[in-house]
Interface confidence: low
């Protein structure tokens, strides 16, 4: 090496093992700020998401036996909480210039856990929306007991599908030794098979984004059109938040799969990747923030009060295992999403 004391930062192109795909326009930086930007972002998500989701999970857990719909928020909060808790673990390789310190098992397991929780969160949100739609617009025979069973099944199905979506990541991950600079990396290796990569990307896009987005948006729209005359800001915020956080992530996946090597599009996508992944992760701390923001009037009383308000807003105020379902119109007037 000519520069024997080359300082290597994550995304620094001072190593020949990362020749300048990001320099197509000549704008190569010795230290790319976009590579280290995820660290403060991860810290913020962790600091907001852990207490926020813990609070929602605690409140939802307390009332889940009385309120069927609280089960949704309990699962959502648990998924988001696990995602937030795993962030410090995944921040270490970024801070260490891409070096993976957790071994081969960790390489398969840790990124898979975070993917599992992210997809579970997305799918649960979609299932919750569908449940609210069915509750409001569905047949009168759909009793609370039947719904309680259905919600449990749907939660299980969401986690199962999330697990299936995560399997390819675990299968195709492996440790990879780079020597210039020396670092052990946890990589996704499709073995040069573009068809496998395309299939994984397409399935993730359909089941992890497009499907849930259609479910969330259409259910929200149906509730707005059929059941409500007034604006429902929390529901709108949840839909918009979902789209804003996840659309760039899945768009990036499509770009990385189809973009021509050496294209300016691929170069920009690769540079933006850490922030886009961070934005997707930020979705895991979004729901508690929305609940607290839209329940800020109740915050004067207490934090749990705001969470209780959010629970009522998101599933029907008086619904419980004991009570008969009120008319759809009455119930939906108490609902969000």
């Amino acid at each position: 090496m000519g520069n024997d004391s080359v300082s290597y930062e994550y995304g620094d192109y001072s190593d020949l093992s990362d020749r300048p795909v990001d320099c197509l326009d000549g704008a190569c930086l010795a230290i790319d700020p976009l590579r280290v930007a995820p660290l403060p972002l991860y810290a913020a998500i962790f600091l907001v998401g852990v207490p926020g989701n813990a609070m929602v999970a605690w409140v939802a857990g307390k009332v889940a036996r009385r309120r069927v719909g609280a089960t949704w928020l309990l699962h959502l909060a648990v998924a988001d909480l696990l995602c937030c808790l795993s962030l410090p673990i995944l921040a270490v390789p970024i801070a260490r210039g891409g070096h993976w310190p957790y071994g081969a098992v960790g390489c398969r397991a840790l990124p898979s856990i975070i993917l599992l929780t992210m997809y579970a969160s997305v799918l649960l949100l979609a299932a919750l929306s569908a449940d609210l739609c069915f509750l409001a617009l569905g047949p009168a025979w759909w009793s609370t007991v039947q719904r309680a069973c259905g919600v449990q099944v749907a939660c299980g199905a969401a986690w199962t599908l999330a697990l299936l979506l995560t399997v390819p990541s675990a299968i195709y991950r492996r440790l990879h030794q780079e020597h210039f600079p020396a670092r052990l990396q946890c990589v996704v290796d499709y073995g040069g098979s573009s068809s496998t990569e395309n299939a994984v990307t397409a399935i993730r896009f359909l089941f992890g984004f497009l499907g849930p987005l259609v479910a969330v948006a259409s259910c929200h729209s149906a509730l707005l059109c059929w059941a409500a005359r007034r604006c429902r800001p929390l529901g709108t915020a949840i839909v918009v938040g979902f789209f804003v956080c996840w659309a760039p992530y899945h768009l990036l996946g499509l770009v990385l799969t189809v973009a021509a090597p050496n294209s300016a599009l691929l170069a920009r996508a690769l540079r933006a990747e850490p922030l886009i992944v961070g934005l997707a992760l930020a979705h895991s701390c979004l729901n508690p923030m929305l609940f607290l923001y839209f329940g800020r009037a109740q915050l004067r009383r207490s934090l749990p009060a705001a969470c209780h308000w959010a629970l009522r807003e998101s599933q029907g105020q008086d619904e419980s295992v004991d009570s008969k379902k009120s008319t759809s119109h009455d119930l939906v007037s108490e609902m969000e999403v």
Epitope: G2, L16, S17, L24, L29, H179, V187
Partner: antibody, heavy 119, light 112 residues
């Protein structure tokens, strides 16, 4: 059209010095990473040195076999890259190609200049 | 350094035949960040400088005839010429740019 033209080759005695030049045109030279690659019947193609652009502080890299003896430099105002070769050995004999580096490949090559180290 | 081994060292085929040549690296050339293999194939005709054919193991350089195909990942790579033409008489090199930059010794293609 990208064009790379090497010059400065010739016959030199072992231990002697020689400076190769490469004049570039047809692309934004100041943005480019430039490399020297040599070819000999004994060793085949062998990467020699690389100099990066201003954004990368004109960082230089060398093959182990030439480290401490060869120096790569550039003059962006003249769109030229140079290879100063000192303490030349018989094994340095070969055709020296100027190439535009980066992008994971050497997409553009000059026609080469022959360096012969012999007594 | 990563060692690149090419085989066979030479082969002679008739025009129109299919040709396959191999390149093996002493360690994986797959980049984690771009998920691409840092391997290129070059063609060097007699008396000329090398010309880029394939980069990132399988991406054909613009202007290269589609009879040239690169494949493989990790440590094993292949260059295939589906129907050899007389003008394909040349030396073919593989090159890795994953760790420093090293070339294979080349495969000499001769036309019968």
């Amino acid at each position: 059209e990208v064009k790379l033209e090497e010059s400065g080759g010739g016959l030199v005695q072992p231990g002697g010095s020689m400076k190769l030049s490469c004049a570039a045109s047809g692309f934004t030279f100041s943005d480019a990473w430039m490399d020297w690659v040599r070819q000999s019947p004994e060793k085949g193609l062998e990467w020699v040195a690389e100099i990066r652009n201003k954004a990368n502080n004109h960082a230089t890299y060398y093959a182990e076999s030439v480290k401490g003896r060869f120096t790569i430099s550039r003059d962006d105002s003249k769109s030229s890259v140079y290879l100063q070769m000192n303490s030349l050995r018989a094994e340095d004999t070969g055709i020296y190609y100027c190439t535009r580096g980066g992008y994971y490949v050497f997409a553009y090559w000059g026609q080469g200049t022959t360096v012969t180290v012999s007594s | 350094d990563i060692v690149m081994s090419q085989s066979p060292s030479s082969l002679a085929v008739s025009a129109g035949e299919k040709v396959t040549m191999s390149c093996k690296s002493s360690q994986s050339l797959l980049s984690s960040r771009t998920r691409k293999n840092y391997l290129a194939w070059y063609q060097q005709k007699p008396g000329q400088s090398p010309k880029l054919l394939i980069y990132w193991a399988s991406t054909r350089e613009s202007g290269v005839p589609d009879r040239f195909t690169g494949s493989g990942s990790g440590t094993d790579f292949t260059l295939t010429i589906s129907s050899v033409q007389a003008e394909d008489l040349a030396l073919y090199f593989c090159n890795q740019s994953y760790d420093l930059l090293t070339f294979g010794a080349g495969t000499k293609l001769e036309i019968k």
